[in-house]
Amino acid sequence: SDKLYQRKEPVISSVHTKVKGIAEVTENVTEGGVTKLGHSIFDTADYTFPLQGNSFFVMTNYVKSEGQVQTLCPEYPRRGAQCSSDRRCKKGWMDPQSKGIQTGRCVPYDKTRKTCEVSAWCPTEEEKEAPRPALLRSAENFTVLIKNNIHFPGHNYTTRNILPTMNGSCTFHKTWDPQCSIFRLGDIFQEAGENFTEVAVQGGIMGIEIYWDCNLDSWSHHCRPRYSFRRLDDKNTDESFVPGYNFRYAKYYKENNVEKRTLIKAFGIRFDILVFGTGGKF
């Protein structure tokens, strides 16, 4: 409630997060022309990436382009990229949609299609749909610990969301445990009215709002956070220009003294932690 006699001050905040959980991933692996089921374990180091600011990212799906080498090759025959003669290919041209620099030659991509030869990481990335269901759909059961320290410098008051009395094995629940700072990712989505399994395919952005409404007067002192959740990206994926949330990264290695890389297009959820509120004191 608004106490007009109080001097109000906006919150200054710092956030630190820790994600925990293990995912078992089953996917088709092709070796020597033979496709078989491959099983792999993903731990925190495999699916989380350090982000700047009050954000963390959890990979929920991916598309791999394995064994890429820097050389010449035909570019992927995306729409409008096919050619029938060298005239269509311009030496030195860097098409923003392409993955390399054209050599000026039109070469066979496969039995039926020709594309411009490019200097690039080869074979160039194919335009594949994100796997459905998501490969790391079990990320729904991962948990995140959010440490939030806040400060009101004008009132010389500092506190944090984690209290010494808190149980490390608790899980946030809006009704039963609203002060627990360990959140199950699936619960965050449920609270926001979203389907984790669906969002995990293409990725998305989820907001975790921490609201501090602090009464710092000694006779009626109260300063505890209130958590709420809402989706921040455009969820109408059919209508949005670039649906979901994804980025690419590479793992580099050497094979027979040749530098190679595995390109990974990672889809996942970026969680943005938004801390706001005021501290009031007479």
Epitope: Q68, V69, T71, L72, C73, T103, R105, V107, P108, P123
Partner: nanobody, 120 residues
Framework: EVQLVESGGGLVQSGGSLRLSCAGS??????IGWFRQAPGKEREEVSC????????YYTNSVKGRFTMSRDNAENTVYLQMNSLKPEDTAVYSC???????????????RGQGTQVTVSS
């Protein structure tokens, strides 16, 4: 139909030479690789050629002894093998792929192979 046919194999004494041919039909290729497989061993990439610029790659064990060339008009590539050693004995085949250049066999052409035997 996409096809590759090898020829030129045979029996030769150590230090001798052979010239293998790989003729393509039914498609225009971009990269051709020569591979060999000795009994009880894995398939090994010997060399590759890129048709557009004629650049070649050779595995270390054949460098300086084998030469790959192409005849675009004839749709044929050649593997000139000199100073042959008994360890070069294998079935040699060509394919529209090159592992060294990360070029997968999207065209799907692969020959049946030709036997090369080097006696000591």
């Amino acid at each position: 139909e996409v096809q590759l046919v090898e020829s030129g194999g045979g029996l030769v004494q150590s230090g001798g030479s052979l010239r293998l041919s790989c003729a393509g039909s039914g498609f225009s290729y971009y990269i051709i690789g020569w591979f060999r497989q000795a009994p009880g061993k894995e398939r090994e990439e010997v060399s590759c050629i890129r048709v557009t610029d004629g650049s070649t790659y050779y595995t270390n064990s054949v460098k300086g002894r084998f030469t790959m060339s192409r005849d675009n008009a004839e749709n044929t590539v050649y593997l000139q093998m000199n100073s042959l050693k008994p360890e070069d004995t294998a079935v040699y085949s060509c394919a529209t792929e090159c592992q060294r250049w990360a070029y997968p066999n999207r065209i799907g052409a692969r020959g049946q192979g030709t036997q090369v035997t080097v006696s000591s």
